[in-house]
């Protein structure tokens, strides 16, 4: 339970007062307000929204609300020279062109400044050539093509379906395969749920709908021109040739009506198996090129987008802590959208707005949190997590010394089935205890706790009677806080019953059809799921900022470290002969995990027993908890990924959205059987085991008695 000592407040000002103040009707009203026009990063409309939020947060009662601006590299289509793809005949005549924009949703026909679908940061170019269908363009898809089917993508334009992995990884894989262009499309198999109508009659993707998105491979760098440092007024910027993470080949997204026209003519090899077939009425032939009658026809891309240094604006609100003002709990989510942002991000921004309003109401009644709470409305998340990363780069010294926790608040919903939580193991117990106190919004669970409905619908694969909590990956604004700075982080949202499609997003993701009406008509008419997410996110922030002892349980880290060590060991043991030949041992890692487990257990015992009325000892114990996540940071970073510095977790090298455990060892082992110099490759595995073992041991020692 929260404790309110030393914060000069009346007894009614507890977690219950905060939660009771949150209202579904307010979230609905805020969502409507935030979604009537586009709020693309770098535009006047998004600047105006930043100023509106600043003004409203001040009215709500925060101590200060400031705009923090940066000048970062963004990307826009050319307004007078649209991007499209053609099928051309042998004379070079365009016999088919893909669409120039999506048909606007009803009621939005006269809205100006709807950015047409494009792949942000695509270089300009007009490549033409034969098409190769590469399935999802995952690492394993290119292995299948190149190694098994002996199909060479060099000099070809590849067409890949969206889904399974982050689009930037698809583009990187295509580049490495030698492709000269990439077409991304949404297949109904991934973006059209059976039995549901297309928007505006349901929540499915229509044939003219297209997913926008950036195609960068930043690996946590933030602004491509100022990696490691804020893009401020005196910044030194790299030349575009040295910019971090930019794609080198043209890329463009299309919908499934256009994809049908490209794929129906495909010839060459048949698909290798049924996992390469989507739901269109086409053969899903791999190519290269078109079938007999159409073999002289080619595909040509016309990409004219430009990269421009543009000003962006974060909104940073502060609610000063009464007892430990130098300890920061951060709640942040982005404000910029591709178009209307009905789900992404405004379903999250509306929840943050209501959380701020509730905290402000308590503050006006005389309450303050024990620790300082920072609220953030990030800009340019869609262009590579730029706003959050630049702010964290600017404030890194403060954050690494004072950052207790970061709670992310992007989309509140991606479905309406059950809760989904990804967080540091330090927060498992916080999430469990909180959800046991909250009411489930789910049909059939009236009067039951959120914990109960969540556990029933999304059970943990390891522990019966507990819900699934996933690893943090990336693709959202917690990245810099967790992966670079080592600040304990978490995220929560309502999700779909669609585990197999985990990383594909909801059907209308990043399309023009992501509107207020989508949410209000189809996902959450009563806004009860939004309210539940507000209670989870807000409740976590309240506890983190207000509990006397930080609600972190280091024993849960010990449990997962053992699980991750077992997993990586079993991967390595697929090569028993090489492990013997090169004397590869995991003993040091298992020993470090054992030490961590014992020391964490002893620390937890001391945590129960110490004198909480002694402010020095209290602060000391809390600092050990706060700095535990920090202890997993390697200042040198992961190989070739200097801004991914967490040794236990990193975004997967094959899918930015997914988290990988012991990523240094995992990447060293990946496809090791194909390495030209096995001795060197296994040497790197041994080095990564050493780094991991050292880091776990060092982290354990931060929990030992200080003297």
């Amino acid at each position: 339970k929260s404790s309110n000592e030393a914060t000069n407040i009346t007894p009614k000002h507890n977690m219950k007062a905060f939660l009771d103040e949150l209202k579904a009707e307010n979230i609905k009203k805020f969502l409507y307000n935030f979604t009537q026009i586009p709020h693309l990063a770098g535009t006047e409309q998004n600047f105006q929204l930043a100023k509106q939020i600043q003004s409203q947060w001040k009215e709500f009662g925060l101590d200060s609300v400031e705009l923090a601006h940066y000048d970062v590299l963004l990307s826009y289509p050319n307004k007078t020279h649209p991007n499209y793809i053609s099928i051309i005949n042998e004379d070079g005549n365009e016999i088919f062109n893909t669409s120039l924009f999506e048909p606007p949703p009803p009621g939005y026909e006269n809205v100006s400044d709807i950015v047409p679908p494009f792949s942000a940061f695509s270089p300009q170019g007009m490549p033409e050539g034969d098409l190769v269908y590469v399935n999802y363009a995952r690492t394993e898809d290119f292995f299948k093509l190149e190694r098994d089917m002996k199909i060479n993508c060099s000099g070809k334009i590849v067409i890949a379906r969206y889904g399974k992995v982050f689009r930037g990884n698809k583009v990187k894989n295509a580049q490495l395969a030698g492709a000269k262009g990439v077409i991304l499309y949404s297949d109904p198999a991934d973006y059209f749920a059976p039995g549901v109508k297309s928007y505006p009659d349901g929540w499915n993707l229509p044939g003219g709908g297209v997913q926008r998105g950036n195609i960068l491979n930043l690996n946590g760098a933030g602004d491509p021109l100022t990696p490691g440092y804020p893009a401020n007024e005196y910044a030194y910027r790299r030349g575009i040739a040295e910019a971090v993470g930019l794609p080198s080949i043209p890329v463009h997204p299309i919908g499934y009506y256009d994809a049908q026209k490209l794929l129906e003519k495909m010839g060459g090899s048949a698909p290798p198996d049924s996992s390469w077939r989507g739901s269109l009425k086409v053969p899903y032939n791999v190519g290269p090129g078109f079938t007999g009658n159409f073999s002289t026809q080619k595909v040509k891309m016309h990409i004219h987008s430009t990269n421009e240094v543009t000003r962006i604006y974060n909104v940073i609100g502060t609610l000063r802590g009464a007892v430990e003002p130098d300890r920061y709990v951060i709640l942040g989510g982005h404000r910029d959208s591709w178009v209307f942002g009905g789900i992404d991000p405004q379903s999250g921004a509306a929840v943050v707005h209501e959380i701020v309003r509730s905290f402000g109401t308590l503050k006006k009644e005389g309450w303050r949190p024990r620790r300082t709470i920072l609220f953030a409305s990030w800009d340019a998340e869609e262009f590579g997590l730029l706003g959050s990363t630049e702010w964290a780069e600017e404030n890194s010294r403060l954050l690494q010394e004072r950052g207790v926790a970061y709670i992310n608040a992007d989309s509140s919903i991606e479905g309406n089935y059950t809760l989904r939580v990804d967080c540091t193991p330090l927060m498992y117990s916080l999430v469990h205890n909180l959800t046991k106190e909250l009411k489930s919004p789910d049909e059939g669970f009236e009067g039951k706790s959120l914990y109960e409905s969540w556990t029933k619908k999304s059970p943990s694969p390891e522990f019966s009677g507990m819900p699934r909590i996933s690893k943090l990956g990336s693709g959202n604004d917690f990245e810099v806080f967790f992966q670079r700075l080592g600040i304990a982080s978490g995220r929560a949202r309502y999700t779909k019953n669609w585990e197999t499609n985990k990383f594909s997003g909801y059907p209308l993701y990043h399309s023009v059809y992501e509107t207020y009406e989508l949410v209000e008509k189809f996902y959450d008419p009563m806004f009860k799921y939004h309210l539940t997410v507000a209670q989870v996110r807000g409740g976590m922030v309240f506890e983190l900022a207000n509990s006397i002892v930080l609600p972190f349980d280091c024993r849960d880290y010990a449990v997962v470290l053992r699980k991750y060590a077992d997993k990586i060991y079993s991967i390595s043991m697929k090569h028993p002969q090489e492990m013997k030949t090169y004397s590869v041992s995991f003993d040091s890692l298992f020993s470090a995990v054992k030490n961590f487990t014992e020391i964490a257990s002893k620390f937890s015992e001391r945590l129960q027993d110490f004198d909480k009325s002694n402010p020095i000892v209290l602060r000391m114990m809390n600092d050990q908890l706060m700095f535990l996540e920090r202890a997993f940071i390697d200042p040198l970073g992961l190989p070739d990924r200097p801004f991914y510095r967490h040794v236990i977790y990193a975004p997967s090298s094959h899918n930015k959205y997914a988290g990988e455990s012991f990523p240094g060892i995992y990447d060293a082992l990946f496809d090791i059987e194909s390495k030209v110099d096995p001795s060197k490759a296994w040497g790197e595995v041994k080095r990564q085991i050493y780094v991991a073992a050292f880091t776990v041991q060092a982290a354990a020692e931060t929990l030992s008695e200080v003297a």
């Epitope: 120039l100 924009f101 026909e109 229509p206």
Partner: nanobody
């Protein structure tokens, strides 16, 4: 309610030009592919031209290719057919029709028709 109203027909000499208009109301032209169809006296319906909602693709019947141009002004909710080098065999009632597929990329079936405008090509 949803309707299409054609205008611009008339009597014109062979070799001359005419521009037909089709004003759409009750729905946004910007979301729909549109067709021109014609019916010569005593004959069946003949499809003439189609343009996608965004203007990116135009398809024509062989009989009119190179002479007729379909276009639209989505801001005015109006479809056009520019007819050049008219011939006697172009004499017909010209109808505009809405394609039934929102955002369709190729001609499909029609779901809404206008009342038609008569074009007579005669010397």
């Amino acid at each position: 309610q949803v309707q299409l109203v054609e205008s611009g027909g008339g009597v014109v000499q062979p070799g001359r030009s005419l521009r037909l208009s089709c004003a759409a109301s009750g729905f946004p032209l910007i979301s729909y592919g549109m067709h021109w169809v014609r019916q010569a006296p005593g004959k069946g319906l003949e499809w003439v031209a189609f343009q996608t909602y965004d203007g990116s693709n135009r398809y024509y019947a062989d009989a009119v290719k190179g002479r007729f141009t379909i276009s639209r002004d989505n801001s005015k909710n109006t479809l056009y057919l520019q007819m050049n080098s008219l011939r006697a065999e172009d004499t017909a009632v010209y109808y505009c029709a809405r394609d039934r597929i929102v955002g369709g990329r190729v001609p499909d079936a029609f779901d809404i028709w206008g009342q038609g405008t008569m074009v007579t090509v005669s010397s």
